[in-house]
């Protein structure tokens, strides 16, 4: 079958569009370190990357292959307010890169680093 | 109190890097539509803008207030292969502008919507 | 349990019109999506349309600008408003529905005939 240009070069895109990539996603810092409901974070979420998008097969999960971690400095409110906002550095993890991996391997991925 | 210069720029980068705005998502297309289990897309996945983010009090939630409607092409395949790729076009709406809003009055404008 | 019902099938001339109706029953949910697909004699059952509560559309390039998908929440109910319907449109078209969160299922109709045929 011979199908338009302009439909293959749209299709290419979106493939690179949707691939497993790290993409930058906010982070609840809140609920990331499940605080307590009297303290605030301001601001109250982070930005950091994550692997994302597509794999071409349902066997398949996008998955980091590396990692950087870094700080990132907030302010801390406790309510009732008895002092002002305090500067708390919290550290997170960067996915750097990832793959496609095999839903298996994942899985034995996982349980091989709880067995440790 | 008084903060360190570098601190302050820094949390203020990370309020605009994580502010509500459109985003790009990857939506699993057969997901979506739930189609029957050998029908499969390639890509497998289209690249929308979704609003996103995070606002500033728990009582806010980020909701989009303009919308652009757009259409894409992927191959579709059915399994067994009897005939080649065949092309389907997908439309949606990408989300073009958002607005921290109440929670109280994103139900209230999803119930009038429901009840028109 | 889920039931679908179809209606609206039947035999048109080519270039006519026809509307397809399938209302899902037996669920206190709202299907996610629901859509149709079609199976001529002798061949694969194909993807015709489909609609998502996720605001998506989908057509088969072979119906696109000719076929109108539609639903109607309240009643839980999709339409497939075929128009300039040609001889290689003759086919059973079967709807389905699909709950998502609540049930990954996807559900099928009987499936109604329609012959297009001077």
């Known amino acids: 079958a011979h199908y338009n240009t302009e439909i293959l070069k749209s299709i290419d895109n979106e493939w690179r569009k949707t691939q497993c990539m790290p993409r930058e996603v906010c982070i609840d810092v809140g609920k990331e370190f499940g605080v307590a409901t009297n303290t605030f974070f301001k601001p109250p979420c982070v930005s950091v990357y994550r692997c994302g998008g597509c794999c071409n097969s349902e066997g398949l999960q996008c998955m980091n292959t590396s990692t950087s971690y870094l700080s990132k400095t907030l302010f801390e409110i406790t309510v009732p307010l008895s002092q002002g906002p305090k500067p708390v550095t919290i550290s997170f993890a960067n996915h750097t890169s990832c793959r496609c991996m095999s839903k298996l391997d994942v899985y034995r991925q996982v349980h091989s680093i709880i067995r440790r | 109190a008084h903060y360190n210069t570098e601190i302050l720029k820094s949390i203020d980068n990370e309020w605009r890097k994580t502010q509500c705005m459109p985003r790009e998502v990857c939506i699993d297309v057969g997901k979506e539509f739930g189609v029957a289990t050998n029908t499969f897309f390639k890509p497998p996945c289209v690249s929308v803008y979704r609003c996103g983010g995070c606002c500033n009090s728990e009582g806010l939630q980020c909701m989009n207030t303009s919308t652009s409607y757009l259409s894409k092409t992927l191959f579709e395949i059915t399994v067994p292969l009897s005939q080649g790729p065949k092309p389907v076009t997908i439309s949606f709406a990408n989300h073009t502008s958002c607005r921290c809003m109440s929670k109280l009055d994103v139900y209230r404008q999803v119930h009038s919507i429901i009840r028109r | 349990e889920v039931q679908l019902v179809e209606s609206g099938g039947g035999l048109v001339q080519p270039g006519g019109s026809l509307r397809l109706s399938c209302a899902a029953s037996?669920?206190?949910?709202?299907?996610?999506?629901m859509g149709w697909y079609r199976q001529a004699p002798g061949k694969q059952r194909e993807l015709v349309s489909a609609?998502?509560?996720?605001?998506?559309?989908l057509y088969a390039d072979s119906v696109k600008g000719r076929f109108t998908i539609s639903r109607d929440n309240s009643k839980n109910t999709v339409y497939l408003q075929m128009n300039s319907l040609r001889a290689e449109d003759t086919a059973v078209y079967y709807c389905y529905t699909y709950y998502r969160e609540y049930d990954p299922e996807m559900y099928w109709g009987q499936g109604t005939q329609v012959t297009v045929s001077s």
């Open positions: 037996g669920s206190s949910f709202s299907p996610y999506a």
């Open positions: 609609t998502s509560s996720g605001g998506f559309t």
